[in-house]
């Protein structure tokens, strides 16, 4: 018996096609992917095979605009008319809260919505109870086949889940689910979750009874043979994983932005053992026709997106210097904006020991594309700020041994007064450079605020120290020559569109006046 | 001919023990989950608990878990329930099913049924 | 645990008669539902598995409708060895449960 799997993982909010690095569309005859062209390549397949099933693997939510003004039902609509056969919960679904996932996809969706690591307490379980589920079991052609779904366990660290949602070790909580399914004579499980690659091939190897794993979060590229485009494979697809008790478990992932879609054909035996598996993402590039109803639903629904990107979000007070003469020179008042938005976008989990997880950020100038002048009325919108951060990226949470902040900062200023990127504008962080010094002993002061404190004061480095960061996703990739970072970063999730969270920042504060304050010497 | 035969039900005291057995013919019995089922006289049908083709995970009802325990010795082709603690409400004709080679399990073959009664 | 609803608990029919017995459920149980025929001092006999599957051997005038939380068990044509207790039974979650059962009777 075969089975096809179609796979999306990591989608963030691409619902219209994208430019080949997945940011806004310029050359329609060279964009890829969006849930139209999606449409018509899952149409075509379940024409042309018997048992398809289209699935998610979480974090739709969250990445462009769509998300910000629709929050979720821009999700449950299109994916409700691509008509997925099931989702996995990923982090970032649960980034508007509980409540900004219950109202307009849980209790929207028409295909199940899965994770069997997250349990509801107290006076959430009532509420939630049945809006999502540990698994399903879906009929395919004549046969059945169990979904299992997964949430990363670091959800709580990465998003606003709250404090009566309790995320399991995935392992821990995916066999008793797989063991009860293969007691209620499910024989083909398919693990569908959000915990990323490492963790993928964990449950590949440690859950008795899963026989594939369909994953998200690590934005993992598989590929066998020539890669299509410019992602570069991080294995062959599907990577095969040996389980503890021999059995061979297909891995698979679809890199991320709705770019490719995964495709995965399964041979089971009677008695539903893997027999055989190939397969490999299908590039939604512009030679796949986006189909016409999608598209003209889309278009319907973005009439509302270019009304919101020209509303006022907040004002300023000050001049907001974002300036390539400044931000790649010097401390400027828009870097300190974007940080302190960055770190209080990542407010969460205080204790008796934690007055936050992270209390970092570090941003390249050359990422600031725009200053906003205060004398058009103070008005900041949408549109201003897409100005300043116009690539699309997301802000990201990595862990780094302090001797690595040292080497990002001694690149920041390498080759210091060319009006070069790399220069970084920083938050909850007091650093001092001496410009007379050779490349690479530069700075001579780095204090960091620390975290484990009940009154925040900034301490000095400590080279062997494990630091939590938040910055963008282009110095994450080792974009602008940290190269450091990308190498010796020891853990990397993916975070909040850029703009979006300057936006909410500044919805929340209503009106700023970021200084520059000494940050930088 | 595919068949199940229930034996081991009886008469006994509240608080004691009692084993049935069902043995298996004319299948592959290592290939089934096998459950049983019981039906107190004149009401209706109750699951109490399965054990999966391999015997490793078992399910019981709340009714009597803790207190009956599920077995299967597939070299032998035989289910055993083991009821301990029983009380007057385990009165019941016992039947051992089989839950069928595919989801959703529905019980395609089952044995004719033992008697327990739990009297003092 | 699911809780299956069966009505009516009984009903009167001659031989000719369409019969139909409902079943609901709790919650959602998608098309996991089985129907069982019994008859007085025997086992049940299963007639259909998966909502709508007739099992093998079971006459057609049985058939079986329905997914989510409401089932049909409809007897097209009542035959004299059709009256018997029919019981519908969930498989979606352990616990397994069973409706109350519906006794068809001679009317």
């Known amino acids: 018996w075969e089975l096809t799997i179609l796979h999306t993982n990591d989608v963030h909010s691409r619902l219209e096609q994208t430019s080949e690095d997945s940011s806004k569309c310029v050359n329609a005859s060279r964009c890829m992917g969006g849930v139209a062209r999606l449409f018509t390549k899952v149409q075509q397949i379940r024409r042309a095979e018997p048992n398809v099933l289209l699935l998610d693997a979480g974090d739709q939510y969250q990445g462009t605009i769509w998300f910000t003004v629709y929050k979720g039902a821009e999700v449950a609509h299109f994916m409700n008319a691509l008509r997925y056969d099931a989702m996995a919960l990923g982090n970032h679904e649960f980034d508007n809260g509980v409540e900004g996932l219950i109202e307009p996809l849980l209790k929207e969706a028409k295909f199940p919505i899965l994770s069997a690591n997250i349990k509801a307490k107290g006076p959430l379980a009532s509420q939630i109870s049945g809006l999502y589920l540990p698994y399903k079991v879906l009929p395919v052609g004549d046969e059945v086949v169990g979904i299992v779904g997964y949430t990363s366990k670091e959800t709580p660290f990465l998003s606003n889940p709250g404090t009566n949602l309790v995320f399991e070790d995935e392992i821990t909580a995916l066999q008793p689910e797989v063991d009860k399914l293969k007691t209620l004579n499910v024989n083909k499980i398919i693990a569908l979750g959000h915990s990323g690659f490492e963790t993928d091939k964990l449950i590949a190897q440690k859950v008795r009874g899963v026989d594939v794993v369909v994953g998200g979060h690590s934005n993992t590229f598989l590929y066998t043979g020539n890669p299509p485009s410019k992602e570069v494979p991080a294995g062959k697809y599907p990577f095969i994983v040996t389980s503890d008790d021999g059995r061979k478990v297909p891995v698979v992932q679809a890199y991320a932005f709705g770019k490719y879609l995964g495709y995965l054909k399964i041979e089971f035996d009677e008695r539903g053992n893997v027999i055989s598996s190939h397969g490999n993402p299908i590039l939604l590039n512009s030679s796949i026709p986006e189909d016409p109803s999608i598209k003209a639903d889309i278009n319907k629904w973005r009439i509302k997106l270019d009304n919101y990107s020209t509303q006022e979000l907040g004002k300023t007070i000050v001049y907001l210097d974002g300036s390539s003469q400044s931000c790649r020179f010097r401390e400027c008042n828009m870097g300190n904006l974007i940080c302190d938005a960055m770190i209080n976008n990542n407010l969460r989990h205080a204790d008796e020991m934690f007055w936050n997880h992270v209390s970092m950020c570090i941003l390249n100038g050359g990422g600031i594309r725009s200053p906003i002048d205060e004398r058009n009325n103070g008005t900041i919108t949408w549109e201003n700020l897409a100005a300043v951060l116009p690539f699309g990226g997301t802000f990201d949470l990595v862990q780094l041994k302090g001797s690595t902040l040292k080497k990002a900062f001694e690149h920041s200023v390498h080759r210091y007064g060319q009006s070069t990127g790399e220069f970084l504008q920083v938050g909850g962080i007091h650093v001092v450079y001496d410009l007379s010094r050779k490349p690479g002993d530069r700075v001579v002061k780095l204090d960091v605020l620390c975290t484990k404190c009940r009154v925040p004061s900034y301490d000095p480095l400590k080279m062997d120290e494990i630091y939590k960061v938040i910055l963008p996703n282009f110095l994450a990739n080792g974009g602008d020559g940290f190269q450091m970072i990308k190498d010796e970063l020891l853990r990397h999730d993916s975070g909040d569109q850029d703009i979006n969270v300057v936006s909410t920042y500044i919805s929340k504060m209503k009106v700023i006046y970021p200084a520059v304050e000494g940050r930088i010497k | 001919e595919v068949q199940l035969l229930e034996s081991g039900g009886g008469v006994v005291q509240p608080g004691r023990s009692l084993r049935l057995s069902c043995a298996a013919s004319?299948?592959?019995?290592?290939?089934?989950?096998m459950h049983w089922v019981r039906q107190a006289p004149g009401k209706g049908l109750e699951w109490v608990a399965v054990?999966?083709?391999?015997?490793?995970?078992?399910y019981y009802a709340d009714s009597v878990k803790g207190r009956f325990t599920i077995s299967r010795d597939n070299s032998k082709n035989t289910l055993y329930l083991q009821m301990n603690s029983l009380r007057a409400e385990d009165t019941a004709v016992y039947y051992c099913?089989?839950?069928?080679?595919?989801?959703?399990?529905?019980?395609?073959?089952w044995g004719q049924g033992t008697m327990v009664t739990v009297s003092s | 645990d699911i809780q299956l609803t069966q009505s009516p608990s009984s009903v009167s029919a001659s031989v000719g008669d369409r019969v139909t017995i409902t079943c609901r459920a709790s919650?959602?149980?998608?098309?996991?539902l089985a129907w069982y025929q019994q008859k007085p001092g025997k086992a049940p006999k299963l007639l259909i598995y998966a909502a709508s599957s007739l099992q093998s051997g079971v006459p057609s005038r049985f058939s079986g409708s329905g997914s989510g939380t409401d089932f049909t068990l409809t007897i097209s044509s009542l035959q004299p060895e059709d009256f018997a207790t029919y019981y519908c039974q969930q498989a979606n979650d352990f616990p397994i449960t069973f409706g109350g059962g519906t006794k068809v009777e001679i009317k």
């Open positions: 054990i999966n083709d391999e015997g490793i995970n078992k």
């Open positions: 919650q959602d149980i998608s098309s996991w």
């Open positions: 004319g299948f592959t019995f290592n290939f089934y989950g």
């Open positions: 099913a089989r839950g069928g080679a595919r989801y959703p399990i529905a019980f395609d073959i």
